[in-house]
Interface confidence: low
């Protein structure tokens, strides 16, 4: 597995790791997707000028890209963790689609798209095992994604610089907040 | 692509050591963990150890702890096993194979290196 | 860990329908890959995380499993398939494999 960044220390600690628990280990593997999705915006931002760019507005009209919410349950304010664990494995249900769109976007990092998109496919896995509440996860529909996907590769070469670099963005916010999420849980 | 290269077949003495390698390309070396496995003809695969790349730091399956020693070159992406006090039991091909992006699994393995321990 | 693998030999058809299992000594959660090492090969990854096929693996390739016991299952063999299959436990250090099913092609 990759190395988490600031993770050294760790490296000299007992010569046998101890199985992790669920939760050191759903941590962990959110800080892998996270390092992934750093690589990825080192190339989308020395490629273009997108990340520094004012018109992500215009992009932003064409995704419905997932956001945490106060009612999600997920902030420290009003916290619930049924309501919020639901939201973090239904957001990322919803993001899938979009990392399948991000999989033909890199050059040099195409290999870390894949493993940004392979880990997040575990990462749903390890939530859906601790979640309770199962049938309150809405998974998102195949045809709608299909067409959703049609679409974002049809469009022009500047929206789909920018749509790449807001997926990446919105995605590391997501993972972010649902990571200080879980751990309050 | 990802591709990790052994270096050749050995031929050793009882009591020698060796130093085999594994030379890594197309992805970043020290992003992930090297691993190695032995293979003696015709039996399974045993795990030796792996190596972090960016730290240096190793973790051996305890039966191999006094025998192999993993280090790391990052400067050219190559990856190291020595083996001492060589015997017979020693002879078998070994693997380095790249931990997987997503647990600790091998995702890529090197074509393996083959040694022979014989007086 | 000790993963006990069953059978050690398989001799079948092509399109036959095989399934080879491991049993771990104790509970690995589902930190368990199949292999496949085909002769003179290098082994490939087929399976991860108990269920999980690698990229570019077929689908007749599955894998399932309960925290002790795990099967591997091929629908339809191919004569391609000719092989050992094994299995790894990556729960905790070390890092075990099972013992080998050297799959056959009558």
């Known amino acids: 597995a990759p190395v988490p960044p600031g993770e050294d220390s760790k490296d000299v600690a007992a010569p046998h790791r101890q199985p992790l628990t669920s939760s050191e280990r759903i941590d962990k593997q959110i800080r892998y997707i996270l390092d992934g999705i750093s690589a990825l915006r080192k190339e989308t931002c020395n490629k273009s000028n997108m990340c520094e760019s004012s018109k992500e507005a215009l992009a932003e009209n064409n995704l419905n890209l997932p956001k945490m919410a106060e009612k999600d349950g997920c902030f420290q304010s009003g916290f619930n963790e049924e309501t919020c664990l639901v939201k973090i494995i239904t957001g990322l249900l919803e993001f899938e689609v979009y990392l399948e769109y991000l999989q033909n976007r890199f050059e040099s990092s195409e290999e870390q798209a894949r493993a940004v998109q392979m880990s997040t496919k575990v990462l749903i896995q390890f939530l859906q095992k601790k979640a309770k509440n199962l049938d309150a996860i809405t998974t998102p529909d195949p045809t709608t994604n299909a067409s959703l996907l049609t679409k974002l590769q049809a469009q022009n070469q500047w929206l789909q610089d920018m749509t790449t670099h807001l997926i990446l963005r919105s995605f590391k916010e997501f993972l972010q907040s649902s990571l200080r999420a879980l751990r309050q849980m | 692509q990802v591709q990790l290269q052994q270096s050749g077949a050995e031929l050793a003495k009882p009591g020698a050591s060796v130093k085999m390698s594994c030379k890594a390309s197309g992805y970043t070396f020290t992003t992930y963990w090297m691993h190695w496995i032995k293979q003696r003809p015709g039996q399974g695969l045993e795990w030796i150890g792996y190596?972090?790349?960016?730290?240096?730091?190793?973790e051996f399956n305890q039966k191999f702890n006094d025998k192999a020693t993993l280090t790391a070159d990052r400067s050219s992406s190559t990856a190291y096993m020595q083996l001492n006090s060589l015997t017979s039991e020693d002879s078998a091909v070994y693997y380095c194979a790249r931990d997987a992006y997503y647990g600790n699994y091998e995702d890529y393995w090197g074509q393996g290196t083959t040694l022979t321990v014989s007086s | 860990i000790v993963m006990t693998q069953t059978p050690k030999f398989l001799l079948v058809s092509a399109g036959d329908r095989v399934t080879i299992t491991c049993k771990a000594s104790q509970s690995v959660s589902y930190d368990v890959a199949w292999y496949q090492q085909k002769p003179g090969q290098s082994p490939k990854l087929l399976i991860y995380y108990e269920s999980n096929r690698y990229s570019g693996v077929p689908d007749r390739f599955t894998g399932s499993g309960n925290g002790t016991d795990f099967t591997f299952t091929i629908s339809t063999v191919q004569a391609e398939d000719l092989a050992v299959y094994f299995c790894q436990q990556v729960y905790t250090s070390p890092y075990t494999f099972g013992g080998g099913t050297k799959l056959e092609i009558k």
């Open positions: 190596i972090n790349p960016s730290t240096g730091y190793s």
